[in-house]
């Protein structure tokens, strides 16, 4: 008789999830000498232990604590780039500007980027059919709790000038309900962070508006100022040129506004 299986609203665990996590870990530790001591099998065991045999709506930060310890890694705290709704450009930027880091440039962020995972209560099976959706099912699911945990702690590590890349093409350039708006903003440490600098990325080629005057950016400024952190904002009118100028800063066309 087939066992009854909970049907969730979200997509199931990414296929070949264990193999993907293990392979990513091996690749990361090979590329980053400071992480060569990491035992990737132990990392996978800790990752698996966070959600296997547990109800996928009842996951806690504590479940991920063994994984967090195994993935301990310091990042230059004044070289942190946060992002919201513009992941690809943020990652393209840090691939060129190698001394800056997004969360996905760290071991744990790299392992989990773009993956989905969940288990089932009281069985050692991974659920490849469906996983809880944050809105439709529950917020304390394995994926959401993981990202909330690492995002909070990444923001807590930041210092001096912290940068955030925001998507100027969206109706809410700053969204209070995004991970940046709901977690990272509130976990920047005022005693360590002097300034949050927002980079608003324009979408349209002919868009010359000052999106730093957008009401949602003003809302972000207000939240940040109340936390005794200074705020600054820059328009990136041409993201393609922006990336090009990061690659080749000596280019004569890079002295003008981008």
């Amino acid at each position: 008789v087939p066992r009854w299986r909970q049907q969730w609203s979200g997509p199931g665990t990414t296929k070949r999830f264990p193999e993907t996590v293990l392979a990513r870990c091996v690749k990361y530790t090979e590329i980053h000498p400071e992480m060569r001591h990491v035992d990737c099998q132990s990392v996978w065991d800790a990752f698996k232990g966070a959600f296997i045999s547990k109800h996928p709506c009842n996951i806690t930060e504590e479940d991920y604590q063994p994984l967090m310890k195994l993935g301990t890694q310091t990042v230059p705290c004044n070289k942190i780039l946060l992002w919201s709704r513009i992941k690809d450009l943020a990652h393209q930027f840090t691939q060129v500007q190698r001394d800056m880091f997004t969360l996905e440039d760290t071991l744990l962020g790299y392992l989990a980027d773009d993956l989905t995972w969940c288990g089932e209560f009281n069985t050692s099976k991974i659920n490849y059919q469906s996983c809880p959706d944050w809105r439709k099912d529950c917020s304390n699911n394995p994926v959401s709790v993981f990202w909330k945990t690492v995002s909070r702690r990444f923001a807590e590590a930041a210092c001096d000038v912290v940068h955030v890349m925001l998507n100027g093409s969206r109706s809410k350039i700053f969204d209070k309900n995004s991970t940046f708006g709901s977690v990272e903003v509130h976990n920047l440490q005022p005693e360590k962070v002097q300034t949050l600098e927002a980079w608003v990325i324009h979408g349209g080629r002919e868009d010359s508006r000052d999106l730093c005057q957008d009401p949602t950016i003003k809302e972000l400024e207000s939240i940040i100022s109340k936390r005794n952190i200074q705020f600054s904002c820059k328009n990136i009118y041409r993201p393609d040129k922006f990336l090009q100028c990061v690659k080749n800063p000596e280019d004569s066309s890079c002295t003008s506004e981008i």
Epitope: M68, T72, P76, C77, R153, A157, D160
Partner: nanobody, 117 residues
């Protein structure tokens, strides 16, 4: 692997001085925020002082004017000079790098400071 080792603790009379040192390996003190925390018996761990790569320095109100945090990039150490010590400064002093919780931070094992009256 990030490791922090504290030294310099001990027993001192009220009004005396001590210099704590924290040696880091596996990470650079010049690129991370470095902090000293302390924990007295039966109390929560509390921030004493911190320094960032941009030399943003913060002290807890209870040590202002008495303690000085500094960094020695060449030796990869962070130091805490403690003057005019008081009995209430008695605690285990811990060195911290980065965040207070893993994965983006690490702690030393701590060094005991005892101030007798």
């Amino acid at each position: 692997q990030v490791q922090l080792v504290e030294s310099g603790g001990g027993l001192v009379q009220a009004g005396g001085s001590l210099r704590l040192s924290c040696a880091a390996s596996g990470s650079s003190v010049s690129m991370n925020s470095m902090a000293w925390y302390r924990q007295a018996p039966g109390k929560q761990r509390e921030l004493v002082a911190l320094i960032t790569p941009g030399d943003r320095i913060n002290y807890a109100d209870f040590v202002k004017g008495r303690f000085t945090i500094s960094r020695d990039n060449a030796k990869n150490t962070v130091n805490l000079q403690m003057n005019n010590l008081k009995p209430e400064d008695t605690a285990v002093y811990y060195c911290n790098i980065g965040a207070t919780r893993p994965p983006f931070g690490a702690w030393g094992q701590g060094t005991q400071v005892t101030v007798s009256s």
